[in-house]
């Protein structure tokens, strides 16, 4: 399950502080991997692999950690400091207009278009018209129309608003 | 724009138990507390308490402790608060109030509801 | 709990002069993060309250410059430089420097 609010969100109360960890707030403000107390008197650590913080914040709360669906791998656990860092699985890609579930990327481009990008975590394979060079982005064409390709390798990680 | 609509109000016999409810729109539900004040007849207010809706954790003023339930129901963007063991002293028109999720700025509350005139009587 | 009490408690006043409020707090609000957590809500005849200053002397959005918060410590004030009509109604102050949330019991303020 994703969570619904990420710290960049919740943004607008993050200024500038120290760079050291301390236990209780620093200029009104806790360190990653920390949330103000009720008070605002404390600095209490976020819970490891449940929640996390990212800035210098005076959040009341850590943000819950991300948990990757099915159809997504975890390139990374959840820290007190860091999300979890969830990708696609090979084969299929996020669109960032629905970033909410991966989708199979397309097998092949249809006739008269040539492939020029490879599935990739965060899109579909891309095709253009052999002659004019540009871009297609309609619909999965019939099988007798494609052109088969492999599914390319990941790149680096698509990062989750939340 | 911000809106917190309240239940309409209630009577309620010494005892029994009475659930309020207000529900928000306007703005993301998840991405603010929802606090609950009490105004007895010819007095000042009270803080009851507030519900956190991203996490479900909830914070209470210790005096109403064990008298106040509150929790939400994310799907309709409805913030609840359930009154227990109702008694006379109870009687009092109730508001719920959004605040902010950061200490800086989380003590003062910038949208009130409309209010829930809870009377309870014998 | 913090015990906030203001005074007057009730306040007639003539539309176009000038109106004050005090509010006391039982302890300082000043927080130990150098922040002071006082704030000022009217609520006008038949409706909920609505926040006029947060933090002293912070205006909210659409309240008009007319009204303003000062003080500090224990002692605070809200002024009205011109009073109008519609600014009748209870005026509470209220504190978040200590848990739990307290207000002051009101100050009503009416057209003489």
């Known amino acids: 399950e994703s969570a619904l609010i990420t710290q960049q969100d919740l943004a607008p109360q993050q200024r500038a502080a120290p760079q050291q960890k301390r236990s209780s707030p620093s200029e009104g403000l806790c360190p990653p991997g920390h949330h103000i107390s009720e008070d605002g008197r404390d600095c209490i650590s976020c819970k490891y692999g449940q929640d996390y913080s990212t800035h210098w914040n005076d959040l009341l709360f850590c943000l819950r950690c991300t948990r990757c669906d099915s159809g997504e791998v975890e390139l990374s656990p959840c820290t007190t400091t860091r999300n979890t860092v969830c990708q696609c699985e090979e084969g299929t890609f996020r669109e960032e207009d629905s970033p909410e579930m991966c989708r199979k990327c397309r097998t092949g481009c249809p006739r008269g278009m040539v492939k020029v990008g490879d599935c990739t975590p965060w899109s579909d394979i891309e095709c253009v018209h052999k002659e004019s060079g540009t871009k297609h982005s309609g619909e999965v064409p019939a099988v007798e129309e494609t052109v088969t390709s492999s599914p390319g390798t990941p790149a680096s990680p698509c990062s989750l608003s939340g | 724009q911000v809106q917190l609509v309240q239940s309409g109000a209630e009577v309620k016999k010494p005892g029994a138990s009475v659930k309020v409810s207000c529900k928000a729109s306007?703005?993301?539900?998840?991405?603010?507390?929802m606090n609950w004040m009490k105004q007895s007849p010819g007095m000042s207010l009270e803080w009851i308490g507030r519900?956190?809706?991203?996490?479900?954790?909830?914070f209470y003023n210790q005096k109403f402790k064990g008298k106040a339930t509150l929790t939400v129901d994310k799907s309709t963007s409805t913030a609840h608060m359930e009154l227990s063991s109702l008694r006379s002293e109870d009687t009092a028109v109730y508001f719920c109030?959004?605040?902010?999720?950061?200490?800086?700025?989380?003590?003062?509350?910038?949208?009130w509801g409309q209010g829930t005139l809870v009377t309870v009587s014998s | 709990d913090i015990v906030m009490t203001q005074s007057p408690l009730s306040l007639p006043v003539t539309p176009g002069e000038p109106a004050s409020i005090s509010c006391r707090s039982s302890?300082?609000?000043?927080?130990?993060?150098?922040?002071?957590?006082l704030h000022w809500y009217l609520q006008k005849p038949g409706q909920s309250p609505q926040l006029l200053i947060y933090?002293?002397?912070n205006r909210f959005s659409g309240v008009p410059d007319r009204f303003s918060g000062s003080g500090s410590g224990t002692d605070f004030t809200l002024k009205i430089s011109r009073v109008e009509a519609e600014d009748v109604g209870v005026y509470y102050c209220?504190?978040?420097?200590?848990?739990?949330?307290?207000f002051g019991p009101g100050t009503k303020v009416e057209i003489k």
């Open positions: 209220s504190q978040s420097t200590h848990v739990p949330w307290t």
């Open positions: 933090k002293v002397s």
């Open positions: 519900f956190n809706p991203y996490n479900g954790d909830t």
């Open positions: 302890q300082s609000l000043v927080h130990s993060n150098g922040n002071t957590y």
């Open positions: 109030a959004r605040s902010a999720y950061y200490f800086d700025s989380g003590g003062y509350f910038d949208y």
């Open positions: 306007g703005y993301s539900f998840i991405g603010y507390f």
